[in-house]
């Protein structure tokens, strides 16, 4: 048998070997495809199948617009002028080249020593599904699950049967100061079909920088709490990788495990004081937050708020 590859939507002509080019012809075309359950013999007079597979006057079979459901086997049996039976057998596969792949949501830059999402490569409208590959500086990137991670997703359109592929690339660059170029290519895996490439993206790799800012958040707001209450201090840092955070109270380090959150449950007067956090980044010095003050006070110690109503129901003015 002969393997035939046809593009979806394009016509395909299969010749019936041995068939006389003009009637009278003794021939039979039959097909087993996604449109049939078993072999379907086509009527030489034509009929409802002509819209998908039609016998031409010369005995060839015309598929006016091949579709996914036309994949399968086509056979012709003809008797030539000398009375000898000649058989033709075709295995038809269809394909569709997708639109040019694109890298969506590309990174603006990368940070050394930490995982960075480079971007997501998207290919829409392929058949069969095909594959997406990433390239670094023109060389194929092989995902190792550690420094190079690829997350893939394949979806099929319920009506057209065509595929959409997505491939998300995450890398851990080893050093800063470089400018790697990433690209993505789609391949159908068919002979004589060149891969489709995205436009390359060139990204700067920077060393992990110092935190851009360090903020100390306190709950309850204002740092005033009743005895037995809970205080939560959160050290907010915008640095990658997240640095180690230590805590200082009244100028002295607290003997606690590093954590960006300090919880003070059931506070007493001994917890009062000035707190700050210190972020230590591997490649940079420590950075201290502005301090916050914690005060433990009975409610009402400061008197009612201005103009509030006391128990007598009369307004009091401080």
């Amino acid at each position: 048998g002969q393997n035939i590859t046809a593009r979806i939507g394009e016509p395909l002509v299969l010749s019936c070997k041995g068939a006389p080019k003009k009637p009278p012809q003794q021939l039979e075309w039959k097909l087993n495809t996604g449109r049939t359950e078993a072999w379907k013999v086509l009527s030489p007079q034509g009929g409802p199948w002509d819209s998908v597979a039609r016998i031409l006057p010369n005995g060839s079979l015309l598929l006016p617009a091949t579709g996914i459901v036309d994949e399968g086997t086509f056979r012709c049996r003809a008797t030539n002028r000398r009375g000898k039976e000649v058989k033709s057998n075709y295995r038809v596969r269809v394909y569709q080249i997708p639109g040019k792949p694109e890298i969506v949501d590309p990174a603006s830059e990368l940070t050394a020593s930490v995982p960075n999402k480079v971007g997501t490569c998207v290919s829409e409208g392929s058949y069969p599904a095909g594959t997406l590959s990433w390239h670094l500086d023109g060389k194929l990137l092989i995902p190792d699950g550690k420094e190079t991670l690829v997350k893939e997703e394949t979806r099929r359109h319920p009506e057209t049967g065509l595929f959409t592929l997505r491939s998300e690339l995450t890398v851990i660059p080893t050093q800063g100061g470089t400018h790697p170029t990433f690209s993505c290519s789609f391949s159908l895996g068919l002979p004589r079909r060149r891969p489709l490439n995205t436009a390359p993206i060139q990204l700067r790799v920077r060393e992990p920088g110092p935190p851009e800012g360090i903020q100390l958040l306190v709950e309850p707001e204002g740092g005033i709490v009743a005895p037995g209450g809970t205080v939560t201090l959160t050290c907010a840092i915008s640095a990658q990788p997240p640095p180690q955070v230590h805590w200082i109270k009244d100028g002295a380090p607290l003997p606690l495990a590093p954590s960006p959150v300090l919880l003070l449950p059931e506070v007493g007067h001994e917890d009062e004081g000035t707190y700050s956090c210190v972020a230590t980044h591997p490649s940079h010095g420590p950075q201290e937050s502005p301090p916050v003050s914690i005060r433990v006070t009975e409610t009402g110690d400061e008197g009612p708020a201005e103009g509030s109503v006391g128990e007598s129901g009369l307004g009091t003015l401080a």
Partner: antibody
Framework: EVQLVESGGGLVQPGGSLRLSCAAS????????MTWVRQAPGKGLEWVAS????????YYPDSVKDRFTISRDNAKNSLYLQMNSLRAEDTAVYYC????????????WGQGTLVTVSS | DIQMTQSPSSLSASVGDRVTITCRAS??????VNWFQQKPGKAPRRLIY???NLADGVPSRFSGSRSGTDFTLTISSLQPEDFATYYC?????????FGGGTKVEIK
Amino acid sequence: EVQLVESGGGLVQPGGSLRLSCAASGFTFNNYWMTWVRQAPGKGLEWVASIDNSGDNTYYPDSVKDRFTISRDNAKNSLYLQMNSLRAEDTAVYYCARGGDILVSLDVWGQGTLVTVSS
Amino acid sequence: DIQMTQSPSSLSASVGDRVTITCRASQDVGIYVNWFQQKPGKAPRRLIYRATNLADGVPSRFSGSRSGTDFTLTISSLQPEDFATYYCLEFDEHPLTFGGGTKVEIK
């Protein structure tokens, strides 16, 4: 809205001729095969003719072959049935319908037009 | 030519009844069978296409099934508006062939 409207029916003598028309709207006419189906009074449905989307290929049952001709004008979104040598047994309501191949088979119908063959 | 033998030719049923109509093809027609409903003085309306698929806008009480060359239209719970004549159609080969019809009447 997808619509088919037949016209041209009427009373005709045996041996006479009549031309039916079907005006299509609401869809891309030249993407579809088209078909005529008839129904004699009090009887069932009978296929009369089909034509492919280009108009190059036509199909008929033996009962009307060589007497009826189906045609189409894609520029005018119109389907026609030329009926010659009419007989009493051709008396029926004639419907035009969209499709007729294995891809789309008679999914939309017109309201029908009555053809009476009588002397 | 393919024959489509439809049965019964008529039936009486009540609202809420389950109704089954069968068409048998004289040879293999694959999945290429439709079912139509026709009310007096109106054009046929397609209910089921390619043996088992419900056409747009058709209530889900209608369903189609196939076993070899036997095709079945089922109305799970007959409604007042379902009293009509039903036809099957084979469109695998020319001539396209309709079944003889089944008239569903009120008991």
